[in-house]
C-alpha cells in the first residue's frame, strides 16, 4: 500500500473561453510534510501554475472542500480561461526540505478550451 497517493480524478476537462476551470486534486495524507504545487506540462520547461506560499497567481484560487475527512483537497479554480491555457495540469506533492523534493505527481488533467 502506498504511503501517499495524489489523485486527479478527471483525465480531462473542457471549458468555454472566458469561463472558469476547476482542476481537482486530493492527497491521502498531510504526511510527508510539504507543499502541493500545480504545474502545466512536465519536465524542466513546465510552468508553475499555483504555489500556496510563493508567487502571485491572480487568476488561481484554491477551492478545497475542508469537510473531506479521509484526504486533503488541493483543488484549484482558474478564472477567465483563454485558449492559451490549454494543456495538461499536474498536481505535485513535495517533501519539505532545502530545497523541497518532488515526491509524487497526480496523473494529470488535460484542459481543453472551447470557443465561446
Amino acid at each position: 500500500e502506498e504511503e501517499l497517493q495524489v489523485i486527479q480524478p478527471e483525465k480531462s476537462v473542457s471549458v468555454a473561453a472566458g469561463e472558469s476551470a476547476t482542476l481537482n486534486c486530493t492527497a491521502t495524507s498531510l504526511i510527508p510534510v510539504g507543499p502541493i504545487q500545480w504545474f502545466r506540462g512536465v519536465g524542466p520547461g513546465r510552468e508553475l501554475i499555483y504555489h500556496q506560499k510563493e508567487g502571485h497567481f491572480p487568476r488561481v484560487t484554491p477551492v478545497s472542500d475542508p469537510t473531506k475527512r479521509n484526504n486533503m483537497d488541493f483543488s484549484i479554480r482558474i478564472s477567465n480561461i483563454t485558449p492559451a491555457d490549454a494543456g495538461t495540469y499536474y498536481c505535485v506533492k513535495f517533501r519539505k526540505g532545502s530545497p523541497d523534493v518532488e515526491l509524487k505527481s497526480g496523473a494529470g488533467t488535460e484542459l481543453s478550451v472551447r470557443a465561446k
Epitope: E3, L4, S29, I31, P35, P62, P66, N70, M72
Partner: antibody, heavy 118, light 112 residues
C-alpha cells in the same frame, strides 16, 4: 471499535532508556499516520513524534530529536517509541494517537506514565 | 515555532448558556483554503477526544452544540448550549506545514 493500548511506561533514572509500545485494533492500521503526544501538569500537551503510514517518514520536535526514535510494524499493528538519554523533563503521560489524514489526532489511547527520576 | 495563545485559561458558564474559547496562532495555519487547527476535549482521567477538525468540521459522533470557526490565525470553539457533561478542559492544536505541531495551553470549562 478503535482501540489503542499503550505499554512500557515506568520509572527510569536520568540517562536511562525505555521503549513504549502501542497495540492498535479496530481500524486499518497500515493506512494511518501514527503519533505520540505527551502530557505534563506543567506543560500541557506536547507533540512528541509522528510516523507516516508505511514508516518511511518520521518527524520529531527539537526537544526529543536525536534521543527518541519512532517505528512501526504494520504486520503486528504496533507502534514503538524508543526513548534514550531520558531527562527529568521527559516525565509525562505518553499517549499514542492515530490520524487518518496526518492532520488531526482522531483517536487516542489511555496513556502510559513515564517517570524520570533519580 | 508557531505559538498558540489560548484564552481564557478557565471559564465558568451557566447551564444552557454559550461558552466561547479562543486560540490565536503566531502565524497563519492555513493552506489551500484549509485551516489546520483542531479542537479536543479532555475530561479528568481520560485522553483527549477530537471534537472539531480543520477549524470548523464536526467530528463524527460529536454533538452539534459544539462548533468551530476562524481562519489564518484566529479561531474559536463555541459550546451552545452548555450541558453538564461538557465540563472538561479544551485544547486547540495546529498541524500546519510548519513543524513542530503545537497545542494551546488549555481552557478549563466549569458550571457557574
Amino acid at each position: 471499535e478503535v482501540q489503542l493500548v499503550e505499554s512500557g511506561g515506568g520509572l527510569v533514572k536520568p540517562g536511562g532508556s525505555l521503549r513504549l509500545s502501542c497495540a492498535a485494533s479496530g481500524f486499518t492500521f497500515s493506512s494511518y499516520v501514527m503519533s505520540w503526544v505527551r502530557q505534563t501538569p506543567g506543560k500541557g500537551l506536547e507533540w512528541v513524534a509522528t510516523i507516516s503510514s508505511g514508516g518511511t517518514y518520521t518527524y520529531y520536535p527539537d526537544s526529543v530529536k536525536g534521543r527518541f526514535t519512532l517505528s512501526r510494524d504494520n504486520a503486528k499493528n504496533s507502534l514503538y517509541l524508543q526513548m534514550n538519554s531520558l531527562r527529568a523533563e521527559d516525565t509525562a503521560v505518553y499517549y499514542c494517537a492515530s490520524s487518518v489524514d496526518g492532520s488531526a489526532f482522531d483517536y487516542w489511547g489511555q496513556g502510559t506514565t513515564v517517570t524520570v527520576s533519580s | 515555532d508557531i505559538v498558540i495563545t489560548q484564552s481564557p485559561a478557565s471559564l465558568a458558564v451557566s447551564l444552557g448558556e454559550r461558552a466561547t474559547i479562543s486560540c490565536r496562532a503566531s502565524e497563519s495555519v492555513d493552506s489551500y483554503g484549509m485551516s489546520f487547527m483542531h479542537w479536543y476535549q479532555q475530561k479528568p482521567g481520560q485522553p483527549p477526544k477530537l471534537l472539531i477538525y480543520r477549524a470548523s468540521n464536526l467530528e463524527s459522533g460529536v454533538p452539534d452544540r459544539f462548533s468551530g470557526s476562524g481562519s489564518r490565525t484566529d479561531f474559536t470553539l463555541t459550546i451552545n448550549p452548555l450541558q453538564a457533561e461538557d465540563v472538561a478542559t479544551y485544547y486547540c492544536h495546529q498541524s500546519s506545514e510548519n513543524l513542530p505541531w503545537t497545542f494551546g495551553g488549555g481552557t478549563k470549562v466549569e458550571i457557574k
